[in-house]
């Protein structure tokens, strides 16, 4: 049996200043259990830009329907874009554990930020 | 339809062991993390175990005990229970594993049961 | 590990009357609820998750609603297939999955 991808299809995305971005990302199977979450960056140092468990993201906003069942697209939307959310964004799979651990990634989107029309 | 058909239930002493099997028909089998509940005669429901592909989980209660596993060429789950005490005594259901959206798993189907009794 | 503690234990009701039950948690599970109904002698079967959506297939006459910690099930116009006992079970954290002690719904 095949093992579960992670699938972001944009390379890049260029968003205008205030705008939104919306950001790609669906998985190719619902197993290993466990939960997805978004990231700008990579390594130890990368920071968490959604959970859908903990935390606040007053910005961030998932593009399927909270209430879809076997939902396999992990797509998010980043509103009010500023260019310091300039980087390379990562949609990671985790396979549910104590703690949870990180089983497969994205091969990340680089979002850039073009100045506002004036 | 979905069907899913437990077997193997059956009495043992304390300390014996059993292998539960189900049997699953009517959707993708491998693509669905399945688990066994069980229900002691008169009380409330109980979750055992759960396994996802490489991935399972255990309640305390079985930890160590029990080894849940599946076979996706024959759509078969299984549950090895091993060291059976009193206590594990219950009508087991094998259930298939449902998400909502960003959520955790529920259980849209359930098999009959097959009752274990552990007795001397 | 999340508790959660169903009200009443037992709820004699009239066919055709309304029946309303609750599924507190002992913390914050958003909306990750599910209810089940297990008629005697039967396997369990999902009615509600989500906190209120509706199983395809199950009659309008059920509707769960609440989040956060404090959930409820209501039955309008109880049929006689609908006395049964009734399980609330949460999926945001675990392992391990846990489910309320039930509520039984019996003719009045």
């Known amino acids: 049996e095949e093992e579960l991808q992670v699938i972001q299809p944009d390379k890049s995305v260029s968003v205008a200043a205030g705008e939104s971005a919306i950001l790609h990302c669906t998985v190719t199977s619902l197993i290993p259990v466990g939960p997805i979450q978004w990231f700008r960056g990579a390594g130890p140092a990368r920071e968490l830009i959604y959970n859908q468990k903990e935390g606040h993201f007053p910005r961030v906003t998932t593009v399927s329907e909270s209430t879809k069942r076997e939902n396999m697209d992990f797509s998010i939307s980043i509103s009010n874009i500023t260019p310091a959310d300039a980087g390379t964004y990562y949609c990671v799979k985790f396979r549910k554990g104590s703690p949870d651990t990180e089983f497969k990634s994205g091969a990340g989107t680089e979002l850039s930020v073009r100045a506002k029309p004036s | 339809e979905v069907q899913l058909l437990e077997s193997g239930g059956g009495v043992v002493q304390p300390g014996g062991s059993l292998r539960l099997s189900c049997a699953a028909s009517?959707?993708?089998?491998?693509?669905?993390?399945m688990t066994w509940v069980r229900q002691a005669p008169g009380e409330g429901l109980e979750w055992v175990s759960t396994?996802?592909?490489?991935?399972?989980y255990y309640a305390d209660s079985v930890k160590g005990r029990f080894t849940i596993s599946r076979d996706n060429s024959k759509n078969t789950l299984y549950l090895q229970m091993n060291s059976l005490r009193a206590e594990d005594t219950a009508v087991y259901y094998c259930?298939?594993?449902?998400?909502?959206?960003?959520?955790?798993?529920?259980?849209?189907?359930w098999g009959l049961g097959t009752l274990v009794t552990v007795s001397s | 590990e999340i508790v959660l503690t169903q009200s009443p234990a037992t709820l004699s009701v009239s066919p055709g009357e309304r029946a309303t039950f609750s599924c507190r948690a002992s913390q914050n599970v958003k909306n990750d609820l599910a209810w089940y109904q297990q008629r005697p002698g039967q396997a369990p079967r999902l009615l509600i998750y989500a906190a209120r959506i509706r199983e395809t297939g199950i009659p309008e006459r059920f509707s769960g609603s609440g989040s956060g910690t404090e959930f409820t099930l209501t039955i309008t116009s109880l049929q006689s297939e609908d006395f049964a006992v009734y399980y609330c079970q949460q999926y945001y954290d675990w392992p391990p999955f846990t489910f309320g002690g039930g509520t039984k719904v019996e003719i009045k």
């Open positions: 396994i996802g592909s490489g991935d399972t």
């Open positions: 009517g959707f993708s089998f491998s693509n669905f993390a």
């Open positions: 259930a298939k594993d449902s998400t909502v959206s960003w959520s955790g798993d529920f259980f849209d189907y």
